[in-house]
Interface confidence: medium
């Protein structure tokens, strides 16, 4: 009963993380302008990874895509990769893991092949949130650097003379939602790997582990992470990043090319 | 193709209000933006407001805030402008401009309403 | 608001001339995403605007290659290589990089 509710929880808690991994990674506010030094700005500009967006004080919204990956920078264009690794690696655990469920019954599945379901699919939801955490922390840390890079350019210039403000980016909500996405599905999935070693016998359980060490490898890096790379897979950031045509989800998810309307 | 075809050349009095309409065809209404510009005789353009059919988000330049309103009618694929309180100044041209998200220019424009102002 | 400054006002050419449309702006038109949103029109009597060039350089569907448009910081030139009986009328620069868009005060493009 316990193993059960541990894969239930784990599945659960992996579930609410990989859409909380998604969420960041569609979301604009990855980088917010920072408005200490201007509270009463008339524009206030946001970043995500697909797009830019700026606010104007009417209310009115224009978000841009970036409509190139060749003059992308390469830690942004990183980012994207971490994340999308993690959505990839994320939903073939979830679908893994639903076969997985000791609750549900598909023929006459043995306890063992269940048990290296199970470690599968944690195994997936642990590089899933360490992905998603990864890309998170890289793109945390390109702003920290730019903010203080760019705080001090304005108030040392040339001769002592103050610079011209510069806009300054400080994290914005993606951030979090990414870290605790990230840390949820990270959760979930050594909650999945502890209801493995309940699900089967010991000696089962070790098979399992020297097995999918080597099989995850070997069976899925080459279709998952190679496949999951391939930003045009993505059909909804394409979309966006082909600028043009916006389904109805998308325009709903996405302010809208002006971040100003 | 991508066609704005605006209503027919108006002639009002001062302080009374009008109403021009844009009907779109030739793409999905919804995903693009619609501009409306004004050309007084024999000037420069100047633009008055975009409207974002999908959501109704309008961004208005502060000249034309209480001049002009910006609607649209979804079913029907057509944006209206309401120009009020008309002076001779308001006479002029007015176009309705259709903007894509992708190069942010107006790519296609209407034929334009020409209005004019006169006791 | 950026106001666009368009020189000359009016431009007599010999068909089969180059032309040139200089074009600068009060700030600079590099959104924050990089892009610079001035784009180029042509109207011809009678007839609304049409757009030419997008993005600076990129020209617009059904625009001959004789149209190009370049920049220099905050200076934007349109050059026509070869002038045509077609390309005369008034041209407008305009940026959407910033609201309120604005627009240039127009270049008459004439013969001499």
């Known amino acids: 009963m316990a193993v059960t509710a541990c894969q239930g929880l784990g599945f659960v808690v992996s579930l609410i993380g990989i859409a909380g991994i998604i969420a960041a990674t569609c979301m604009d506010q990855w980088s917010t302008q920072d408005l200490y030094n201007n509270p009463v700005t008339a524009v206030f500009n946001y970043q995500g990874l697909w797009r830019s967006c700026v606010r104007e004080s009417s209310g009115f919204t224009e978000c841009r895509g970036y409509f190139t990956l060749l003059g992308l920078p390469a830690m942004l264009q990183a980012v994207r990769a971490l994340m999308i690794v993690g959505i990839v690696l994320g939903a073939i655990g979830l679908l893994v893991s639903i076969f997985a469920l000791k609750c549900i019954r598909i023929g006459s599945m043995e306890d063992s092949a269940k048990a290296n379901m199970t470690l599968t699919s944690g195994i997936m939801f642990i590089v899933s949130g360490l992905c998603a955490i990864a890309g998170v922390s890289v793109f945390a840390n390109m702003l920290v650097t730019n903010f203080w890079m760019s705080t001090a350019n304005m108030y040392t210039g040339m001769g002592g003379m103050v610079q011209t403000v510069q806009t300054r980016y400080t994290f914005g909500a993606a951030l979090f939602v990414g870290w605790v996405a990230g840390g949820l599905t990270l959760i979930g999935g050594v909650m999945m790997c502890i209801a493995c070693r309940g699900l089967a016998p010991e000696e089962t359980n070790y098979k399992a582990v020297s097995y999918h060490a080597s099989g995850h490898s070997v069976a899925y890096k080459p279709g998952g992470f190679k496949a999951s790379t391939g930003f045009g897979s993505n059909t909804k950031n394409k979309k966006i990043y082909d600028g043009g045509a916006r389904t109805e989800d998308e325009v709903q998810s996405y302010p809208s090319k002006h971040d100003y309307v | 193709q991508v066609q704005l075809q605006q209503s027919g050349p108006v002639l009002v009095k001062p302080g009374a209000s009008v109403k021009m309409s844009c009907k779109a065809s030739?793409?999905?209404?919804?995903?693009?933006?619609m501009n409306w510009v004004k050309q007084s005789h024999g000037k420069s353009l100047e633009w008055i407001g975009i409207?974002?059919?999908?959501?109704?988000?309008?961004s208005y330049n502060q000249k034309f805030r209480g001049k002009a309103t910006l609607t649209v009618d979804k079913s029907s694929n057509t944006a209206y402008m309401d120009l009020n309180s008309l002076t001779s100044e308001d006479s002029a041209v007015y176009y309705c401009?259709?903007?894509?998200?992708?190069?942010?220019?107006?790519?296609?424009w209407g034929q334009g309403t020409s209005l004019t102002v006169s006791s | 608001d950026v106001v666009m400054t368009q020189i000359p006002f009016s431009l007599p050419v010999s068909l089969g001339d180059q032309a040139s449309i200089s074009c600068r702006s009060s700030?600079?038109?590099?959104?924050?995403?990089?892009?610079?949103?001035l784009h180029w029109y042509l109207q011809k009597p009678g007839q609304s605007p049409k757009l030419l060039i997008y993005?600076?350089?990129d020209r617009f569907s059904g625009v001959p290659d004789r149209f190009s448009g370049s920049k220099s910081g905050t200076d934007f030139t349109l050059k026509i290589s070869r002038v045509e009986a077609e390309d005369l009328g008034v041209y407008f620069c305009s940026q959407t990089t910033h609201a309120p868009f604005t627009f240039g005060s127009g270049t008459k493009l004439e013969i001499k």
């Open positions: 030739g793409y999905t209404f919804t995903d693009y933006y």
């Open positions: 409207f974002n059919p999908y959501n109704g988000g309008i």
């Open positions: 993005k600076v350089s």
């Open positions: 401009a259709r903007e894509d998200g992708n190069s942010g220019a107006m790519d296609y």
């Open positions: 700030q600079s038109l590099v959104h924050s995403n990089g892009n610079t949103y």
